[in-house]
Interface confidence: medium
């Protein structure tokens, strides 16, 4: 049975600033044919037929649901892209994470401007902070890492706060063991 294709993002963030670039790639098993990919944005078929969809100079209307399909194989699960205009944007490698998987958070400044005195918060409580901008990495996410995250920082001497982001860590499905 052919596997569903999967949409991946490069860079891996599904929340980006207006004007930034992101590449969506449709990955799957044994898809060798060029120009055999269908891309859907908010349900509408895109003109792009390559396995990669480049979003250059992102606009607000690029926000929404993206799915891909290779020939007659099932559509991929949707990926949601959000385009923002703000001083700070909290980005996550995934908003729904399987327990045991890594989770990366990034406090991203508008136009890649330097952000310093960065503090990450979870459920209103300060997590780690740095004077330069660092990412937070959780190597093995647990259910306790679920929560509402945001970051604060200084851009051009002024203090800003990102919009909150909900992160959900779900339990990995139990393996089924059969008696031999």
């Amino acid at each position: 049975v052919p596997q569903k294709p999967k949409v991946s993002l490069n860079p891996p963030w599904n929340r980006i600033f207006k004007g930034e670039n992101v590449t969506l790639t449709c990955n799957g098993n044994n898809f060798f044919e060029v120009s055999s990919t269908k891309w859907f944005h908010n349900g509408s078929l895109s003109e792009e037929t390559n396995s990669s969809l480049n979003i250059v100079n992102a606009k607000f209307e690029d926000s929404g649901e993206y799915k891909c399909q290779h020939q007659q194989v099932n559509e991929s699960e949707p990926v949601y892209l959000e385009v923002f205009s703000d001083w700070l944007l909290l980005q996550a490698s995934a908003e729904v994470v399987m327990e045991g998987q890594p989770l990366f958070l990034r406090c991203h400044g508008w136009r890649n401007w330097d952000v310093y005195k960065v503090i990450y918060y979870k459920d209103g409580e300060a997590l780690k902070y740095w004077y330069e901008n660092h990412n937070i990495s959780i190597t093995n996410a647990t259910v306790e890492d679920s929560g509402t995250y945001y970051c604060t920082g200084k851009v051009w001497q002024l203090d800003y706060e990102s919009e909150p982001l909900n992160i959900t860590v779900i339990k990995a499905p139990r393996e089924k063991y059969w008696l031999q």
């Epitope: 005195k117 997590l127 004077y131 330069e132």
Partner: antibody, heavy 119, light 110 residues
Framework: EVQLVQSGAEVKKPGESLKISCKGS????????IGWVRQMPGKGLEWMGI????????TYSPSFQGQVTISADKSISTAYLQWSSLKASDTAMYYC????????????WGQGTMVTVSS | QSALTQPASMSGFPGQSITISCTGT?????????VSWYQQQPAKAPKLLIY???KRPSGVSSRFSGSKSGSTASLTISGLQTEDEADYYC??????????FGTGTKVTVL
């Protein structure tokens, strides 16, 4: 009251090991970096290194890298500074200090631990 | 990294003003708005006087003020009083969670 309480004065011989402590209270110890500062007799303050007790992330001054080890035990809200082999030149007052992210400074200081290394 | 440069000593009469300089580099003082100043009385732990170049914590006298121009920070003590006799140290964030202190200035009230 937010405070850092350091262990008492120590007199050691060259070559001996030592671990001094700094216990935090009155705040969430795991959420603020703790720095260590040396002051040799009659001299100025020297920044040695810093630790984030929440995950033991540590940074050292190049002058002290490999000379000392900074660690923390978050279960008892205590940071440590240790030497594996003391030298006479380690004779100094050692302070721990709490970093404050909202002021970018060391806002709370321990009372200091005097370490004397002499044969 | 090298210590920030401060004058070894300064003195003034009660009521006068003195300004202590603290010279660093573009990598520390010049790169961050994170210069702090500490007062150390004899046989005491340092006490925070100024943070973020020019801000004063609550409880610190308004006679103490900080400023910065380029890679040089300054601490001004106005209306000098006998209790201001102490050692003063600047400190700057120097990147990647490192700090550097100044060489220290001994202030004498004549």
């Amino acid at each position: 009251e937010v405070q850092l309480v350091q262990s008492g004065a120590e007199v050691k011989k060259p070559g001996e090991s030592l671990k001094i402590s700094c216990k935090g209270s009155g705040y969430t110890f795991t959420k603020y970096w703790i720095g260590w500062v040396r002051q040799m007799p009659g001299k100025g303050l020297e920044w040695m290194g810093i630790i984030y007790p929440g995950d033991s992330d540590t940074t050292y001054s190049p002058s002290f890298q490999g000379q000392v080890t900074i660690s923390a035990d978050k279960s008892i809200s205590t940071a440590y500074l240790q030497w594996s082999s003391l030298k006479a030149s380690d004779t100094a007052m050692y302070y721990c200090a709490k970093d404050n992210p909202f002021t970018g400074s060391f806002d709370i200081w321990g009372q200091g631990t005097m370490v004397t290394v002499s044969s | 990294q090298s210590a920030l440069t401060q004058p070894a000593s300064m003195s003034g009469f009660p009521g006068q003003s003195i300004t202590i300089s603290c010279t660093g580099t573009r990598d520390d003082v010049g790169n961050y708005d994170l210069v702090s100043w500490y007062q150390q009385q004899p046989a005491k732990a340092p006490k925070l006087l100024i943070y973020e170049d020019n801000k004063r914590p609550s409880g610190v006298s308004s006679r103490f003020s900080g400023s910065k121009s380029g890679s040089t920070a300054s601490l001004t003590i106005s209306g000098l009083q006998t209790e201001d006799e102490a050692d003063y140290y600047c400190c700057s964030y120097a990147g990647d969670y490192t700090y550097v202190f100044g060489t220290g200035t001994k202030v004498t009230v004549l």
